[in-house]
């Protein structure tokens, strides 16, 4: 399955919007910094096929979309930027979904892929628990925004590598 060219543009737009969403200086939140243990090994693109990678990317974008669709998120960010960001993620989900659907009839979720999906889910669990512990404070959201920028960058790079493989 080939992701449309507009998909990579959407990735870049999502990253730009997330950067624009920053409201407070990252330096004023240094005390709140946290290592969420991003599962980099699931995004290095070497250990599984393209179809499996796309399932993991879908999980990553879906969890990001859900995270920024909560009431707490709506209260934290400027509404129009948040809506544009969510729209970009939604479009990416549609692209990825179409690719996964092509493969679903062919094979059940491979065992290796299952652990990758769980690793992504656990990563977002750590983010969710951090936000709850910090009572969704502005600094907590800023730390999470910076973290999601990092994880989306990994996703973008993996997608670039997948396109080069084609």
């Amino acid at each position: 399955c080939d992701l449309p060219q507009t998909h990579s543009l959407g990735n870049r737009r999502a990253l730009i919007l997330l950067a624009q969403m920053g409201r407070i200086s990252h330096f004023s939140c240094l005390k709140d910094r946290h290592d969420f243990g991003f599962p980099e090994e699931e995004f290095d693109g070497h250990q599984f096929q393209k179809t499996q990678a796309i399932s993991v990317l879908h999980e990553m974008i879906q969890q990001t979309f859900n995270l920024f669709s909560t009431e707490d998120s709506s209260a934290a960010w400027e509404q129009s930027l948040l809506e544009k960001f969510s729209t970009e993620l939604y479009q990416q989900l549609n692209d990825l979904e179409a690719c996964v659907i092509q493969e679903v009839g062919v094979e059940e979720t491979p065992l290796m892929n299952v652990d990758s999906i769980l690793a992504v889910r656990k990563y977002f669990q750590r983010i969710t628990l951090y936000l709850t512990e910090k009572k969704y404070s502005p600094c907590a959201w800023e730390v999470v925004r910076a973290e999601i920028m990092r994880s989306l960058s990994f996703s973008t790079n993996l997608q670039k590598r997948l396109r080069r493989k084609d």
Epitope: S55, H58, Q62, Q63, F65, N66, S69, L93, L96, E97, V100, I101, V104, E108, T109, V114, D115, L118, R121, K122, F124, Q125, R126, T128, L129, T132
Partner: antibody, heavy 119, light 108 residues
Framework: QVQLQQPGAELVKPGASVKLSCKAS????????MHWVKQRPGQGLEWIGE????????IYNENFKSKATLTVDKSSITAFMQLSSLTSEDSAVYFC????????????WGQGTLVTVSA | QIVLTQSPAIMSASPGEKVTLTCSAG???????LYWYQQKPGSSPKLWIY???NLASGVPARFSGSGSGTSYSLTISSMEAEDAASYFC?????????FGSGTKLEIK
């Protein structure tokens, strides 16, 4: 509010199949994995598997791979579980439960469907 | 798969009594992925405690959860009649996800 609606009961004959439904409302159906859980009378809970309604990918507990088949119908926002070659061991209450994270993990359950396998 | 063993299987407590239910895992479970559910007869399970020690919405403050590794517990500081129910621990640290066999808590 989030709701998962399941029929109350199904009576089926040994060797037959049954397709259980779980109709979702109050949230975007395609955003969350749907899980299925078995509970035999007076017993514990067993995780059967999960399906992502967005694209239909499934993850099964090995113990249920040859017994259960998970599907979804996005147009009717409903998840399904087909149980095949039924025996008395399959008589149980089957719940659907919505995935999520933190305080939302299995925070929403259907009322359960009681499946009775009897001649 | 990770087997969760709950003890005791059945216990009864008097109103006001302190109650501790335990959940022992066959192999280590990260505390972030250890949950507890309450179930009353004829009803579906209700999320009660998430990530070992966080109370779900609407759960009374007399409940608490603790533990790490292979040993977890749910404690009620002062038993009340409405707490009579079955309690199940659950892990989603690794596939397949598993539940304990449950502890049925009765009121004396």
């Amino acid at each position: 509010q989030v709701q998962l609606q399941q029929p109350g009961a199904e009576l089926v004959k040994p060797g037959a199949s049954v397709k259980l439904s779980c109709k979702a409302s109050g949230y975007t159906f395609t955003n969350y994995w749907m899980h299925w859980v078995k509970q035999r009378p007076g017993q514990g809970l067993e995780w059967i598997g999960e399906i992502n309604p967005s694209h239909g990918r499934t993850i099964y507990n090995e113990n249920f791979k040859s017994k259960a088949t998970l599907t979804v119908d996005k147009s009717s926002i409903t998840a399904f579980m087909q149980l095949s070659s039924l025996t008395s061991e399959d008589s149980a209450v089957y719940f659907c439960a919505r995935g999520g994270l933190g305080p939302a993990w299995f925070a929403y359950w259907g009322q359960g469907t009681l499946v009775t396998v009897s001649a | 798969q990770i087997v969760l063993t709950q003890s005791p299987a059945i216990m009864s407590a008097s109103p006001g009594e302190k109650v501790t239910l335990t959940c022992s895992a066959g192999s280590s479970v990260d505390s972030s992925y250890l949950y507890w559910y309450q179930q009353k007869p004829g009803s579906s399970p209700k999320l009660w405690i998430y990530s070992t020690s966080n109370l779900a919405s609407g759960v009374p403050a007399r409940f608490s959860g603790s533990g790490s590794g292979t040993s977890y517990s749910l404690t009620i500081s002062s038993m009340e009649a409405e707490d009579a129910a079955s309690y199940f621990c659950h892990q989603w640290s690794s596939y397949p996800f598993t539940f304990g066999s449950g502890t049925k808590l009765e009121i004396k």
